[in-house]
Interface confidence: low
């Protein structure tokens, strides 16, 4: 008499997480009499996944129905899979028995799940840096297999080249997941700047995922300063103007010193951006030069976004002979520029 | 993901008539198609199951009044030769009942049995 | 062959009430738990509101409950509301993959 044969017909079954794996069983003859068991593994440490004899196991039905006479197809549908149901499986033909007796095992099907890796996260540098520094971004997605997975950065639609990737873990596993950090050169003009991590993996059906950081966040435009005076008015006053150019973030406090004494502090808000996403902000200060007898050194001084004051002075010359308030006769002063 | 009937018409007594079920948004590899109909003023009545692989069953009743069988994203039902008390509402569903529930519904094909 | 048995044919309930309906299988349904619950409104498809005899689907509001093992099953909707005014059916699954069988319906009326 022929020796009974179980037959499972796929050496290797890939499904999409989240799908039904259809794992087929047949047998070669209904002799001897015993049921069919499924399990994932082999040997004593073997995870039974399915008992066509009894048993509950929610996630698995099999295909055609194990009660029916004749019936040699022991194939199973496992519902919901996840990165975690992979592995081989085996359809086991037990011999009926006080216990069943094991008879013979098919030679196993083995299950790889392709899982779509999460949307990737972007960081960027802790603290911010100023223009010509480097910094760097880190990208990571999870969950994902097969390890196959290929990751690219890109700076404004141009791909960047100084990446360094990982894909752990390094043997093989349910799922996995990929690390990447990209060093960025800023420059003053990446405000508006944008760095892309794009992962594209064979689960993705060539529609990459995409995680974005705005260098917005990472960089600092220090600001220009300029201090200048404008004519004098006919009532001895003159005005001088802080002008803070260029700068990012917003982030800004100019305080005023006449003779280094503050004068006035002004905090920067609601300020227009330029093209380039700085801002500019232009203070005024009236300067009594009736009140005057001597010289005034005014100081604007620049704190923009926590770090160490910017100064830029500038000498307010007062003529020996002040002229009266309301004098239409200008006062003999020239401005010095001092840093 | 969805399912539609189509091919539901009036037809005389004994004309093999043959429903469509188109799919669309999942895969007839990881799914069975059910049918199910209901006669007017009547309640729902399960035909069968188109599965994965070559496996059709259908209830008891309904064995030899039926046959199915599938495409890549179709899933037809034959109503080999239809009787009076054929005419009904036939709708498809994806599922196989149990842990894999009849979820989503085509919107129905109302085939009409008359001399 | 597996028979489902429904009660009652129909019920009436006002608007924040509660309705049950009962669905008895003349055996053991498939591991116990092979019973969903579906609504039907004229003139649309079916819906389906549990699966595994408790299991809510995606997408169905709380109120709407499946409890029961074996042979005995019942749905509730608790806080009803005009919207839910339908037919319920339970489906049962026997131990042969081709036993499914619906019960004869619950019609809720909703005042």
């Known amino acids: 008499e022929e020796e009974l044969q179980v037959i499972q017909p796929e050496k290797s079954v890939s499904v999409a997480a989240g799908d039904s794996a259809t794992l087929n069983c047949t047998v070669s003859s209904l002799i001897p009499v015993g049921p069919i068991q499924w399990f994932r593994g082999a040997g004593p440490g073997r995870e039974l996944i399915y008992n066509l004899k009894e048993g509950h196991f929610p996630r698995v039905t099999p295909v055609s129905d194990p009660t029916k006479r004749n019936n040699m197809d022991f194939s199973i549908r496992i519902s919901n899979i996840t990165p975690a149901d992979a592995g081989t499986y085996y359809c086991v033909k037990f011999r009926k028995g006080s216990p069943d007796v094991e008879l013979k095992s098919g030679a196993g099907t083995e299950l790889s799940v392709r899982a779509k890796p999460s949307a990737p996260v972007v960081s960027g540098p802790a603290v911010r840096a100023t223009a010509e520094h480097t910094v760097s971004f880190t990208c990571e997605s999870h969950g994902f297999s097969p390890r196959d997975i290929t990751l690219k950065w890109f700076k404004n639609g141009n791909e960047l080249s100084d990446v360094q990737t990982n894909v752990d873990p390094a043997g093989k596993s349910v799922s996995y997941s990929i690390r990447s950090t990209a060093r960025v050169v800023l420059t003053r003009r990446d405000v508006h700047s944008q760095v892309i991590c794009e992962v594209a993996h064979v689960t993705l059906q060539g529609d990459p995922l995409r995680g974005t950081a705005n260098l917005s966040e990472a960089i600092r435009v220090p600001p220009f300063l300029e201090v200048t005076q404008q004519s004098m008015r006919a009532d001895n006053q003159v005005n001088v103007t802080c002008q803070v150019t260029k700068f990012y973030p917003q982030r800004l406090q100019l305080t005023w010193l006449e003779n280094g004494n503050v004068s006035r502090t002004e905090m920067a808000s609601a300020l227009p951006e330029n093209k380039d996403g700085t801002y500019n902000w232009t203070s005024w200060l009236l300067v009594n030069v009736s009140a005057h007898r001597d010289d005034v050194k005014l100081t604007c001084q620049v704190e923009h976004d926590g770090q160490p004051a910017v100064n830029k002075s500038f000498s307010v010359k007062v003529s020996a002979h002040p002229k009266e308030q309301g004098s239409n006769t200008a006062a003999e002063n020239t401005g010095t520029n001092e840093r | 993901r969805s399912v539609e009937e189509s091919g539901g018409r009036l037809v005389t007594p004994g004309t093999p008539l043959t429903l469509t079920c188109t799919v669309s948004g999942f895969s007839l590899s990881s799914h069975g198609i059910s049918w199910v109909r209901q006669a007017p003023g009547k309640g729902l009545e399960y035909i069968g199951t188109?599965?994965?692989?070559?496996i059709t069953y259908f209830a008891s009743w309904a064995k030899g009044r039926f046959t199915g069988s599938k495409t890549s994203t179709t899933v037809d039902l034959k109503i080999t030769s239809p009787t009076t008390e054929d005419t009904a509402t036939y709708f498809c569903a994806r599922g196989s009942a149990w842990n894999d529930p009849f979820d989503p519904w085509g919107p129905g094909t109302l085939v009409t049995v008359s001399s | 062959a597996l028979v489902m048995t429904q009660t009652p044919a129909s019920v009436s309930a006002a608007v924040g009430g509660t309705v049950t309906t009962k669905c008895q299988a003349s055996q053991s349904v498939y591991g116990n738990n092979d019973l969903a619950w579906y609504q039907h409104k004229p003139g649309q498809p079916p819906k389906l509101l549990i699966y595994?005899?408790?299991t809510l689907a995606t997408g169905v509001p709380s109120r709407f409950s499946g409890s029961g093992s074996g042979t005995q099953f019942t749905l509730t909707i608790t806080g009803v509301q005009s919207d839910d005014a339908a037919t319920y059916y339970c489906?049962?699954?026997?131990?042969?993959?081709?036993?499914?069988?619906f019960g004869g319906g619950t019609e809720v009326v909703v005042k």
């Open positions: 489906l049962g699954g026997g131990d042969d993959e081709a036993d499914n069988v």
């Open positions: 595994l005899a408790s």
């Open positions: 188109i599965g994965t692989g070559v």
